[in-house]
């Protein structure tokens, strides 16, 4: 069942988003997502991931940058930037620690 989270080791992550229910969350990995909606300032959300690990490997665009990491509170001090309209060379480490 692709929707059911796997029963693997969990990591504790900083949680700062409207979906948080506490200061931290637990999941299979930690995430930072920087999103810019049309006509608004970019918003950075920190939390946990359990599904769709493939999002971690996506390249940054001018609208979204998705970062993942796998250690305790590893998403706490990460700051992301969005890609310029004309993207430069590929940014490494979007699925790193």
């Amino acid at each position: 069942d692709p929707v059911k989270p796997s029963r693997g080791p969990l990591v504790t992550c900083t949680c700062e988003s409207p979906h948080c229910k506490g200061p931290t969350c637990r999941g299979a990995w930690c995430t930072v997502v920087l999103v810019r909606e049309e006509g608004r300032h970019p918003q950075e959300h920190r939390g946990c991931g359990n599904l769709h690990r493939e999002l971690c490997r996506g390249r940054p665009t001018e609208f979204v940058n998705h970062y993942c990491c796998d250690s305790h509170l590893c998403n706490h001090n990460v700051s992301l930037v969005l890609e310029a309209t004309q993207p430069p060379s590929e940014q490494p480490g979007t699925d790193g620690q």
Epitope: K4, P5, S6, R7, L10, T12, C15, E16, S17, P18, H19, C20, K21, G22, P23, T24, C25, R26, G27, G47, C48, G49, N50, L51
Partner: antibody
Framework: EVQLVESGGGLVKPGGSLRLSCAAS????????MSWVRQAPGKGLEWVGR??????????DYAAPVKGRFTISRDDSKNTLYLQMNSLKTEDTAVYYC????????????????WGQGTLVTVSS | DIVMTQSPLSLPVTPGEPASISCRSS???????????LDWYLQKPGQSPQLLIY???NRASGVPDRFSGSGSGTDFTLKISRVEAEDVGVYYC?????????FGGGTKVEIK
């Protein structure tokens, strides 16, 4: 750093009222589900109740012994949690802890990772 | 409500020796996702409780690896491989499967 500081405890007569406060800092309080847990002198831990974040409906749940007498509320602008205790009984005598924690993203699981130092409520004539 | 039962009530231990605490629930705490919704807390003398183990067997951050949690369904065990003097206090199990969350009565660990 997450910090929870309770206040408002004291001595009250049976049938009286008291309001406890919990000042929170170091995290986005408005997102957090907050609970009260109490401990009678020399006894074990007992969950009192919980309030969800406003984004999750802001609903409250209570343990059977306090339902209808205790009310949990929150002021997100002040990062403060409250426990209004009415019709107090001698068996409500306890240290009251404010707590919040950690949820597992794939389900409704929630643990209590962060605790205040507690405030003592004594109900006695 | 789910009833949590701990044993023993009191556990005298010798530093350096292992220790084990049992916790039983009145119904299964195994969630469909494969995790057991069972936590262990330690309350040291004069302090607030602290989380030791979550989801049955996962150590909370900063908890020494001499602590381990095991079990599934209704039977759970907290083990301390080599007790240290700082481990004294009251240990509680708690089920987090249903509201209200409920605690066991506690096990007081003290040095012999």
């Amino acid at each position: 750093e997450v910090q929870l500081v309770e206040s408002g405890g004291g001595l009250v007569k049976p049938g009286g009222s008291l309001r406890l406060s919990c000042a929170a800092s170091g995290f986005t309080f408005s997102n957090a589900w907050m609970s009260w847990v109490r401990q009678a002198p020399g006894k074990g831990l007992e969950w009192v109740g919980r309030i969800k974040s406003k984004s999750d409906g802001g609903t409250t749940d209570y343990a059977a012994p306090v339902k209808g007498r205790f009310t949990i509320s929150r002021d997100d602008s002040k990062n403060t949690l409250y426990l209004q205790m009415n019709s107090l009984k001698t068996e409500d005598t306890a240290v009251y802890y404010c707590t919040t924690g950690n949820y597992y993203d794939g389900s409704g699981y929630y643990s209590f990772d962060y605790w205040g130092q507690g405030t003592l409520v004594t109900v006695s004539s | 409500d789910i009833v949590m039962t701990q044993s023993p009530l009191s556990l005298p231990v010798t530093p350096g020796e292992p220790a084990s605490i049992s916790c039983r629930s009145s119904q299964s705490l195994l969630h469909s996702n494969g995790y057991n919704y069972l936590d262990w807390y330690l309350q040291k003398p004069g302090q607030s409780p602290q989380l030791l183990i979550y989801l049955g067997s996962n150590r909370a951050s900063g908890v020494p690896d001499r602590f381990s949690g095991s079990g599934s369904g209704t039977d759970f065990t907290l083990k301390i491989s080599r007790v240290e003097a700082e481990d004294v206090g009251v240990y509680y199990c708690m089920q987090a499967l249903q509201t209200p969350p409920t605690f066991g009565g506690g096990t007081k660990v003290e040095i012999k």
